[in-house]
Amino acid sequence: APTSSSTKKTQLQLEHLLLDLQMILNGINNYKNPKLTRMLTFKFYMPKKATELKHLQCLEEELKPLEEVLNLAQSKNFHLRPRDLISNINVIVLELKGSETTFMCEYADETATIVEFLNRWITFCQSIISTLT
């Protein structure tokens, strides 16, 4: 059974992931991003189901495509380079989902834009955090 300290750690990691995803969304979905139209042409795979931490496997598998799209954005939109930002997210995702469990991600039929993709995972983080508090 999860201890209160492990639950607290999970909550903090989720909050960190949430802030990173929100920062990326704010960094691209704004009036000062000249590449937004171009970025919205890239398609991302969405999870068929995302209700548990193991489903973060679906996010992990899309981090490389995410980095590639973020490379289009002006660096001033983020505090970190896309590579470092994605690396940080990857570390948190691996810790949250656990590396020992092998979960095959199932994707929805329809792909999504980067805005829809980020918002989906922001919603996921908020949902899990609410169950922990």
Partner: antibody, heavy 122, light 107 residues
Framework: QVQLVESGGGVVQPGRSLRLSCAAS????????MHWVRQAPGKGLEWVAV????????FYVDSVKGRFTISRDNSKNTLYLQMNSLRAEDTAVYYC???????????????WGQGTTVTVSS | DIQMTQSPSSVSASVGDRVTITCRAS??????LVWYQQKPGKPPKLLIY???SLQNGVPSRFSGSGSGTDFTLTISSLQTEDFATYYC?????????FGPGTKVEVK
């Protein structure tokens, strides 16, 4: 004070063209993205189009894509909406609107013009 | 496109009443939601941005809440000047979309 004044509306036949203008004053026009929003008689609000501060991005509602073009002239502090192949369903009051932030979308639109009426009828 | 729905479509109320209007998005939009007030023959007026932040100059009797798909606009004590139509609008993805509106009428 911050002000937006639309002009160019009128009665036009289906299939014809019209160009709306929106003159901005009281703020740094060239720093802000700008929107057009319309409202058909007795109906709700419908967002039409947006243009970035520098014209680098433009987005439209599906129903006007390929027919309407949003543009701007920052040297004249003026926003435009070129409307071609007009249809009866384009009949509405057209508002230009300035965002509440020059960066964030979720600050909404805080400055609106009084609107200009476009009537498409044969 | 993200669809926005509002309920009720109209509400009859008296001065001093507490009025609650709900807005629902067809998919999660986090807090990328805005509320407007419109009176006949006038342009809309921004009330609430980012789901819960009060626009400068808007009376504190107006408040917004919610995140994700479900949002609420509350007028704590209705005043004469509040009789109008209220619209929610998502600002997450283009095309931006408005709710159909809620008309607050005199009872």
């Amino acid at each position: 004070q911050v002000q937006l004044v639309e002009s160019g509306g009128g009665v036009v036949q289906p299939g014809r063209s019209l160009r709306l203008s929106c003159a901005a004053s009281g703020f740094t026009f060239s720093s802000y993205g700008m929107h057009w929003v319309r409202q058909a008689p007795g109906k709700g609000l419908e967002w039409v189009a947006v243009i970035w501060y520098d014209g680098s991005n433009k987005f439209y509602v599906d129903s006007v894509k390929g027919r309407f073009t949003i543009s701007r002239d920052n040297s004249k502090n003026t926003l435009y909406l070129q409307m071609n192949s007009l249809r009866a369903e384009d009949t509405a009051v057209y508002y230009c609107a300035r965002p509440g932030s020059d960066y964030y979308f979720y600050y909404g639109m805080d400055v609106w013009g009084q609107g200009t009426t476009v009537t498409v009828s044969s | 496109d993200i669809q926005m729905t509002q309920s009720p479509s109209s509400v009859s109320a008296s001065v001093g009443d507490r009025v609650t209007i709900t807005c629902r998005a067809s998919q999660g939009i986090s807090n990328w939601l805005v509320w407007y007030q419109q009176k006949p023959g006038k342009p809309p007026k921004l009330l609430i941005y980012a789901a819960s932040s009060l626009q400068n100059g808007v009376p504190s009797r107006f408040s917004g809440s919610g995140s994700g798909t479900d949002f609420t606009l509350t007028i704590s004590s209705l005043q004469t000047e509040d009789f109008a139509t209220y619209y929610c609008q998502q600002a997450l993805s283009f095309p931006w979309t408005f709710g159909p509106g809620t008309k607050v009428e005199v009872k």
